[in-house]
């Protein structure tokens, strides 16, 4: 679609006569008529084929015309045009005398003809003005032409539709040859297709509008290149959506159990050496001089009662020191100086001599002890308590506080390693020994049958177009990640271009 | 009176050139698109070439499409046709002429004779 | 190309006749044809041109009709200075066309 534009510029008839060589009376008022049709091979009368069009009375006799409108008439004179423009054409122009005011055709004699044209032309569409002038021995036109498209009409031939816009259906400009120029941020044939986000995954990550990177299912990050591990999964990491990959010192479907109780919670205190011995369970090799499940108790060198014969421990800083009394000395008053004629056995002790009196033994009631009978029995000194249990004196009675895992007054018991049901997906569960063991239904395996070896959701290939499919553990589900250009939960539909446009 | 003379026919040998001239005179020469128009002895009219008022717009029949050029120089109202490469073929009566029927225009040259042969 | 078929390729009449050529185009021609009258050593003569139009100074005797492929030629009554070659030429596309031709003799 375009407009064949004809600017006339002058026309000359000084003796201001017809064609027929009579006259006009009293000059020549002249109007033009103008006929653009196909390109023949001999100009021949005919329809015009490309349209018409007529001007009011421009002139009289000789006169050059205004390039703007005149007389309501336009110049240039304009002969749209709505089909591919051909390059060449046949033009007809008719200079014609007006004697009244009425100019249709029926109106005028045959012979008010002053002049006629007949050109083959040849013309590119946007050329600049072609000019041309035609001579007869009476008159001379000057006129010149072009050929421009019509708005949103692009191309050689003005055949090239292309509106410029900025919607759903397209974000681009146009260019002088009719071809889409996109605008910044926009892709593909039509500049439909967001550029997304700089380093925006290919496959993981798509865009709805430019600069913009949302992620497939299964991803995360800024770039959609972070897969999403596991729901659930604590300490543990993931190379395709929805794994588990444990990190070290952790186990279990969901990596939340604790391989590594020791480096993950350092609960030995005061310098004591972990060592891990199971699931959250681990045990403190104490450094001197302290006591307790987690050495966290800072022992005293005096509570073992070093000091014999009433002698009296102080704790020193390298130590201890025993102050003995009268009738003893020794590290640890254990030298005697006394005999039974001195009294020296407590809480009713009977004394028995030795070595012809120079010494003497102390025959203790129950519940005392102690060279002299001076001390109470500490109940806790043959180390009763099994498992590493802590012994606690309760007056005339002892108690033992156990360790994780341990039970019973002397913590000689194993608690059941199965009381919490340690195996998953209804595996069952024996105490052994060391630990337990589970045995596991069928579709599952590993030492907590956490572990799905048959039941596959993927197995089946349910997704299209060359998804990658995802197994979803915990729901017994897969996830189909589509590649681009499909959508569906099993990526079953294309997206596809709109076949054409609505403008 | 309107005249169209042909001129520059003659005798040559095949692969050789001939210039033809063709001058007007009693018309507005520039006004009009020229032909050249030949026959061939004892055959019908056949047309070789056209040229356009201005000279922009130039067709050529295929059998001579390379080898003939046809031009015109309005100053001097002479159409011309260059005639390269010639054969046998091309032996025929030349003929100029300005045709425009919606002008009523109908011009014919008597023709120059060009003979080809070795 | 388009081919121009005409006939006869030759007539034998007598001064008074009615003689009717015709030529038919390989495809529509839109009325853009000529009819011409050619004698020994004479250039050929318009007399008919966009089908029916007479060309000035023809006499009226002769006519012309068709549209789309086919056209006629008429002349309502033979004189003396008719008997001549007729061809037609169309002018609607390059490469221009002609007529084999019509030999009009005296019967």
């Known amino acids: 679609s375009g407009v064949f534009q004809l600017q006339l510029q002058e026309f000359i008839n000084e003796r201001g006569v017809l064609a027929s060589g009579r006259p006009c009376e009293p000059g020549c008022r002249t109007f033009f008529r103008v006929c653009l049709k196909h390109f023949q091979a001999v100009v021949s009368p005919g329809p015009c084929t490309f349209g018409t069009v007529s001007t009011p009375v421009l002139g009289t006799n000789s006169f050059a015309v205004r390039d703007d409108s005149s007389g309501g008439g336009r110049n240039p004179l304009q002969l749209p045009f709505n089909f591919t423009w051909p390059g060449t054409f046949s033009l007809i122009i008719e200079a014609w005398h007006a004697p009244g005011d009425d100019l249709r055709p029926e109106a005028l004699p045959p012979d008010a003809l002053i002049s006629k044209i007949a050109i083959q032309g040849s013309l590119a569409v946007g050329q600049n003005w072609l000019l041309d002038e035609q001579t007869s021995t009476l008159t001379r036109l000057r006129y010149s032409y072009r050929v421009i498209c019509s708005d949103n009409y692009y191309g050689d031939n003005c055949s090239r539709l292309c509106k410029k816009r900025n919607d759903h259906f397209g974000h681009y400009v146009c260019q002088p040859d009719g071809n889409l120029s996109c605008l910044p941020g926009w892709t593909g044939e039509y500049c439909q297709q967001p550029i997304c986000l700089s380093g925006c995954h290919e496959q993981n990550g798509y865009c709805s509008k430019p600069a913009e990177c949302l992620c497939r299912p299964g991803w995360q990050g800024r770039l959609c290149n972070e897969c999403i591990p596991h729901n659930g999964c604590r300490h543990g990491t993931c190379s395709t959506p929805w794994q588990c990959t444990c990190d070290e010192g952790w186990g279990g479907l969901f990596c939340d159990q604790d391989l590594n109780y020791c480096t993950h919670h350092s609960p030995c205190k005061n310098g004591a050496t972990c060592s891990n011995s199971g699931q959250r369970s681990y045990t403190c090799t104490c450094r001197p001089g302290y006591t307790g499940v987690d050495c966290e108790l800072e022992l005293s060198e005096c509570d073992s009662n070093p000091c014999r014969n009433g002698g009296s421990c102080k704790d020193q800083e390298d130590g201890y020191h025993c102050l003995c009394p009268p009738g003893y000395y020794g590290l640890h008053c254990e030298h005697s100086t006394l005999s039974c004629a001195d009294s020296p056995c407590f809480n009713g002790g009977s004394c028995r001599e030795r070595n012809q009196g120079a010494n003497y033994a102390c025959e203790c009631p129950p519940n005392f002890t102690g060279s002299n009978c001076e001390k109470k029995v500490d109940r806790c000194t043959s180390n009763p308590c099994a498992n590493g249990g802590q012994c606690l004196n309760r007056g005339p009675s002892r108690m033992c506080r156990c360790r994780p895992g341990f039970t019973g007054t002397y913590c000689e018991l194993h608690v059941s390693d199965c009381a919490r049901n340690p195996c998953a997906h209804g595996g069952t569960c024996h105490d052994l020994e060391n630990g337990l063991m589970c045995t596991c239904p069928a579709g599952f395996s590993g030492r907590r049958c956490e572990v799905r070896t048959s039941i596959d959701a993927c197995a089946s290939s349910p997704c299209f177009n060359r998804a990658t499919c995802y197994t979803d553990l915990s729901t017994d589900t897969f996830v189909c990640n589509c590649p681009y250009g499909f959508v569906g939960s099993r990526c079953e539909f294309p997206v596809g271009l709109p076949p054409s446009f609505p403008w | 009176e309107v005249q169209l003379v042909e001129s520059g026919g003659g005798v040559v040998q095949p692969g050789r050139s001939l210039r033809l001239s063709c001058a007007a005179s009693?018309?507005?020469?520039?006004?009009?698109?020229m032909y050249w128009i030949r026959q061939a002895p004892g055959k019908g009219l056949e047309w070789v070439a056209f040229i356009s008022h201005g000279g922009g717009i130039t067709y050529y029949r295929d059998s001579v499409k390379g080898r003939f050029t046809i031009s015109r120089d309005n100053s001097k109202s002479t159409l011309y046709l260059q005639m390269n490469s010639l054969r046998a073929e091309d032996t025929a009566v030349y003929h100029c002429a300005a045709l425009n029927w919606e002008l009523g225009i109908d011009y014919w040259g008597q023709g120059t004779m060009v003979t080809v042969s070795s | 190309d388009i081919q121009m078929t005409q006939s006869p390729s030759s007539l034998s009449a007598s001064v008074g006749d009615r003689v009717t050529i015709t030529c038919r185009a390989s495809e529509d021609i839109y009325s853009n044809l000529a009819w011409y009258q050619k004698k020994p050593g004479k250039s050929p003569k318009l007399l008919i041109y966009a089908a029916n139009r007479l060309q000035d100074g023809v006499p009226s005797r002769f006519s012309g009709s068709g549209s789309g492929t086919d056209y006629t030629l008429t002349i309502s009554s033979l004189q003396p200075e008719d008997f001549a070659t007729y061809f037609c030429l169309q002018g609607s596309k390059f490469p221009l066309t002609f007529g084999q031709g019509t030999k009009l003799e005296i019967k």
């Open positions: 009693g018309f507005t020469f520039s006004n009009y698109g």
